[in-house]
Interface confidence: medium
């Protein structure tokens, strides 16, 4: 007898993994056998669409290979022209593992700045984002959030926020994990310790002290009076993101030094800076105190110049006089560099035996200045361009530092050797006489400015260089 | 923080040669003389050899004159002593030290802790 | 040849004052031979105490003092202490045709 088509089995939600097999069942009992149809989301499923299979006379429906479009609701529909057609429906549910579609990555920021590291993701159940930081969960707080999107957020990010970060998308079906990624904190350069200004005595060492945080590790620049420092030592240490910067300074004037702490972010910089002032207690004092002491010259750069057994005078207004006399010799010969083979050894020579003066033992230890014969004979013959070209640069202010102001003596100002023989020094180093004069080059005037005497002549003419400190 | 630190020291026979080093940080090398200082075993103190801040000069003990030769590398910051013609009297822990300034005489303000040489058969 | 002189040792009660000295085997020490002192303790390198006659090392206490007494150099110690117990070392530039730099022979102190 005939049999109008009833279903069975009605259609079930049914839940399937992408990539999986999906099999909708439709079973029907009716004579003669029925058309069954499918249809998702109330279009026709086509016989020949070889994305499903359809058996068993149209009762089973298989989706071989489920994808995330795959998802909607899907009917079978009976008819065997006996009584009306009948339907059963039920969903599909494509679930997914989580997945991260936009993953995070390495951000550097500069620290009291807003950070956001991505992490969008895909699944179904909707995956749940939580973030790791180095090895442990990352707790929210009133700065981090992890926001809706999965995305992390960092308010007024610092310095301890550095570090690897991962996010973990996590549903019923799994866990996927971002790589690690890198948050770099870069921090202005900040200055921890100042530099502190000094009184100091002329031609004493003082150090000056700059101590400086950053990331990165700031570089340390010193400034002094306006131009990058020409002399001193400079000293630096880093340890743990904190460079330690120390000038040792010779001090011979009076001057600005600032600290400059400077260091990247991006293209552009960031600097910290901090002055201190070095000021010298009565600044004439060289010039005029004679408090020292008689000493063995043991020193290096005039070797060559003072006699080898000779007591020099050692001014005790230097915090270290063998120390800062020997600097100024040494100083001095750099601030004369181009001199001619004719002048250096008169030059050394008047410059060592005019800072280590010969020394007159006694209850008060006394200095004894050059005789100005000779002052005069290296002023006037040996250097006389070299002198002329010196006087000129210290009228115009080009020499860096006051320090050649003690190295040359004013001729004038000195002992004749005519009013008392023992009153001053002879320079054993000019070793010429009257007759030698014809051999050097042409004065700048026509004769000498005072009668230079028969200096004590010795076998050689020539004049003994130290070959360690010459003056090119 | 100064540090100096030898190297170089071991068992040599008679005649034989051996290279001091002497590392040296926490200073700014090039500014400072340096010296080269022995102890024999159970003995005092006996300076070897000096030399200033740019190298120019050297010094010697008498007896060392002729076989030791001090020298700097300031771009290294290294002090060296080469030993040659050792005797058994060359015997010591060799001291490197700092002396207070830049001349080859200061005091010796910082020393390492010193490489023992012994020369034997 | 002039060889540095020195105390072979010594001994001084904890709170005691100390003068060791620093002399010539002929001649007198004089500020030109820049007296430094040194202290070394056992199995360890020396320690600068004083340079140049009377200038202290940075960190070495108030109670070393270094002078010229007549024709030696001397070094002071006021309120010794246990820790002061060492070997005490003299050392002296010298200009004899060529500079040379000559330690003394050691004093062995004992804090008793």
């Known amino acids: 007898l005939p049999k109008a088509p009833v279903i069975t089995t009605p259609l079930e939600t049914v839940d399937a993994l992408v990539e999986e097999v999906a099999t909708f069942m439709c079973a029907v009992e009716s004579y003669p056998q029925p058309e069954i149809s499918w249809t998702r989301n109330k279009i026709l499923i086509k016989l020949f669409d070889t994305r499903y299979s359809i058996r068993e006379n149209g009762q089973l429906l298989t989706i071989l290979s489920v994808e995330d479009s795959d998802d909607g609701i899907y009917c079978c529909t009976a008819n065997n022209g006996v009584g009306g057609a009948v339907e059963s429906c039920g969903a599909l549910q494509v679930k997914m593992k989580p997945k991260i579609t936009r993953p995070p990555i390495n951000v550097k920021i500069i620290e009291g700045l807003k950070a956001v590291l991505p992490c969008t993701t895909m699944g179904n159940p909707k995956p749940s984002v939580s973030w790791i930081k180095g090895d442990s969960p990352l707790r929210e707080n009133s700065r981090i959030a992890v926001l809706e999107s999965g995305s992390l957020r960092i308010h007024n990010v610092q310095k301890e926020d550095a570090g690897q970060y991962r996010c973990v998308a996590k549903n019923s079906l799994g866990t996927a994990y971002s790589k690690v990624v890198k948050l770099e904190v870069e921090v202005f350069a900040r200055i921890l310790r100042a530099p502190e200004s000094h009184n100091v005595t002329f031609g004493s060492f003082v150090t000056l002290h700059c101590t400086a945080t950053g990331i990165p590790v700031p570089t340390i620049t010193w400034i002094e009076n306006g131009n990058a420092v020409s002399s001193g030592s400079i000293q630096e240490s880093v340890k743990d993101r904190v460079i330690d910067s120390r000038l040792q300074l010779f001090i011979t004037k009076p001057g600005l030094y600032t600290c400059i702490a400077t260091n990247k972010h991006g293209e552009k910089f960031s600097t910290a800076k901090a002055a201190a002032t070095i000021s010298i207690a009565e600044w004439s004092k060289p010039q005029k105190d004679n408090k020292g002491y008689c000493a063995q010259y043991r020193g290096e750069v005039c070797n060559a110049v003072l006699a080898k057994d000779a007591l020099v005078f050692l001014n005790t207004s230097y915090a270290d006089p063998e120390e800062a006399q020997e600097l100024l010799v040494h100083t001095a010969w750099n601030e004369l560099k181009v001199v001619s083979p004719v002048c250096r050894p008169a030059a050394e020579a008047l410059l060592c035996n005019h800072i280590f003066q010969e020394c007159s033992p006694g209850v008060v230890p006394t200095p004894i200045p050059i005789c100005r014969e000779y002052c005069l004979a290296v002023k006037e013959l040996f250097c006389a361009k070299e002198w002329l070209v010196m006087e000129e640069k210290t009228h115009r202010g080009l020499y860096r530092s006051e320090m050649h102001l003690l190295s040359v003596p004013e001729c004038s100002k000195l002992p004749s050797m005519h009013w008392d023989p023992t009153a001053c020094a002879r320079l054993p180093h000019l070793d010429y006489n009257k007759e030698n004069l014809k051999t050097f080059p042409p004065m700048t005037s026509s004769k000498p400015s005072v009668d230079i005497p028969n200096l004590p002549s010795s076998s050689s003419s020539s004049f003994s260089v130290s070959p360690t400190y010459s003056m090119t | 923080e100064v540090q100096l630190l030898e190297s170089g020291g071991g068992l040599v026979q008679p005649g034989g040669s051996l290279r001091l080093s002497c590392a040296a940080s926490?200073?700014?090398?090039?500014?400072?003389?340096m010296s080269w200082v022995r102890q024999a075993p159970g003995k005092g103190l006996e300076w070897v050899s000096a030399?200033?801040?740019?190298?120019?000069?050297?010094y010697y003990k008498e007896s060392v004159k002729g076989r030791f030769t001090i020298s700097r590398d300031n771009s290294k910051n290294t002090l060296y002593l080469q030993m040659n013609s050792l005797r058994a009297e060359d015997t010591a822990v060799y001291y490197c030290?700092?002396?207070?300034?830049?001349?080859?005489?200061?005091?010796?303000?910082?020393w390492g802790q010193g490489t023992l040489v012994t020369v034997s058969s | 040849q002039t060889v540095v002189t020195q105390e072979p040792s010594f001994s001084v009660s904890p709170g005691g004052t100390v003068t060791l000295t620093c002399g010539l085997s002929?001649?007198?020490?004089?500020?030109?031979?820049?007296p430094d002192w040194y202290q070394q303790t056992p199995g360890q390198a020396p320690r600068t105490l004083i340079y140049?006659?009377?200038s202290r090392h940075s960190g070495v206490p108030d109670r070393f003092s270094g002078s010229i007494l007549g024709n030696k150099a001397a070094l002071t110690i006021t309120g010794a202490q246990a820790d002061d117990e060492s070997d005490y070392y003299c050392?002296?530039?010298?200009?004899?045709?060529?500079?040379?730099?000559?330690f003394g022979g050691g004093t062995k102190l004992t804090v008793l």
């Open positions: 926490g200073f700014t090398f090039s500014d400072y003389g």
């Open positions: 030399i200033p801040w740019q190298g120019g000069s050297t």
């Open positions: 002929s001649g007198s020490v004089t500020s030109s031979n820049y």
């Open positions: 140049s006659t009377d």
């Open positions: 050392g002296l530039y010298m200009y004899s045709g060529s500079k040379n730099y000559v």
């Open positions: 030290a700092k002396r207070s300034g830049r001349i080859a005489f200061g005091a010796l303000d910082a």
